[in-house]
């Protein structure tokens, strides 16, 4: 008789999840000499320990503390790039501007990027069939709690000028319910962070509106100002040219507004 299994609304654990986490960990520690000391078997054991045998709607930040400890990493606190709903461009940017870092450029972010995982209460099995959906099932699921935990820590570490890349093509350019809006904004430390600079990325070719005047950006400015952090905003009208100019800042066409 097959064991009854909880059916969740979200996709199941990414296939070859353990192998993927281990392979990514080894690759990351090979590429980043400052993380060579990390033992990837221990990282996997800590990762697994955070959700295996636990009810996938009952995960806490505490469950991830052993993993956080093992993955402790110092990134230059004044070189942090946050993003919301525009991950690919943010990652393309840090691939070119190597001294800046998104969360996914850190070990823990790199390990989990684009992966899904969950377990089952009281069994050591990984659930490859389905995992809880944040909206339809529960918010305290293994994936959501992981990203909340690492995002909070990443924001807490930031200092000086923090940059955030926002998607100007969306109806809510700043969304209070995004990880950036619900976690990172509220965990920037006013005693360390002087300014939050938003880069609003335009999608349309002929879109010359000043999206820094968007009501949701004004809302972000209000939240940030109330936290005693200065706010500035820039329109990035041509993201393709923006990346090109990051690659070749001497290019004559890069002196004009991007």
């Amino acid at each position: 008789v097959p064991r009854w299994r909880q059916q969740w609304s979200g996709p199941g654990t990414t296939k070859r999840f353990p192998e993927t986490v281990l392979a990514r960990c080894v690759k990351y520690t090979e590429i980043h000499p400052e993380m060579r000391h990390v033992d990837c078997q221990s990282v996997w054991d800590a990762f697994k320990g955070a959700f295996i045998s636990k009810h996938p709607c009952n995960i806490t930040e505490e469950d991830y503390q052993p993993l956080m400890k093992l993955g402790t990493q110092t990134v230059p606190c004044n070189k942090i790039l946050l993003w919301s709903r525009i991950k690919d461009l943010a990652h393309q940017f840090t691939q070119v501007q190597r001294d800046m870092f998104t969360l996914e450029d850190t070990l823990l972010g790199y390990l989990a990027d684009d992966l899904t995982w969950c377990g089952e209460f009281n069994t050591s099995k990984i659930n490859y069939q389905s995992c809880p959906d944040w909206r339809k099932d529960c918010s305290n699921n293994p994936v959501s709690v992981f990203w909340k935990t690492v995002s909070r820590r990443f924001a807490e570490a930031a200092c000086d000028v923090v940059h955030v890349m926002l998607n100007g093509s969306r109806s809510k350019i700043f969304d209070k319910n995004s990880t950036f809006g619900s976690v990172e904004v509220h965990n920037l430390q006013p005693e360390k962070v002087q300014t939050l600079e938003a880069w609003v990325i335009h999608g349309g070719r002929e879109d010359s509106r000043d999206l820094c005047q968007d009501p949701t950006i004004k809302e972000l400015e209000s939240i940030i100002s109330k936290r005693n952090i200065q706010f500035s905003c820039k329109n990035i009208y041509r993201p393709d040219k923006f990346l090109q100019c990051v690659k070749n800042p001497e290019d004559s066409s890069c002196t004009s507004e991007i």
């Epitope: 392979a23 080894v26 000391h37 033992d39 078997q41 221990s42 054991d45 800590a46 052993p66």
Partner: antibody, heavy 118, light 109 residues
Amino acid sequence: EVQLVESGGGLVQPGRSLRLSCAASGFTFSSYAMSWVRQAPGKGLEWVAVISYDGSNKYYADSVKGRFTISRDNSKNTLYLQMNSLRAEDTAVYYCAHLRFGYGMDVWGQGTTVTVSS
Amino acid sequence: QTVVTQEPSLTVSPGGTVTLTCASSTGAVTSDHYPCWFQQKPGHPPRALVYSTDTIHSWTPARFSGSLLGGKAALTVSGVQPEDEADYYCLLYYGGARVFGGGTQLTVL
């Protein structure tokens, strides 16, 4: 300097017990998985057991499962191997190894000799 | 019980090239087995040479290289030196447990 020093080896009768220790220094012991490996006289290496950084995960070779127990005390930077129901075929040099996943065992102790004989 | 098989012995001339292989009884060796290679000389503990299939340690001479070859892990020594005479062991990872190969005695004649 990373160092591993094994102790506790000796001559023991079949069926008896012995506990090996491995004192670690020069690295953050509590962040690493650790292993025991043995080598019988004139024979090859045999992986015995591995323990995760916090002691929560342990894996054993089939030849020692149920008889040997690997453990660690992170406050003392020490790895242990409790060996029960010893047999003549357990006679070997036992090495403690600092294991980094994917990197193989990149630091080894000098080994401690266990002889099981009546 | 998983068995990892190596050539028991190989002989090579100084300056020559030799390839040692490592096969798994469970099927093809892949990068998921994270093959590692060790060198051991009489009276000494083993010394790691290659990890993660093909990456050499900082102390490993460049004449040593690792690869996957026809479903096996392989260690190639190019321009063999007299001091390379030793026993060589591969180690494979099986989801927590590890298994050493039986070892290859390399003679440099």
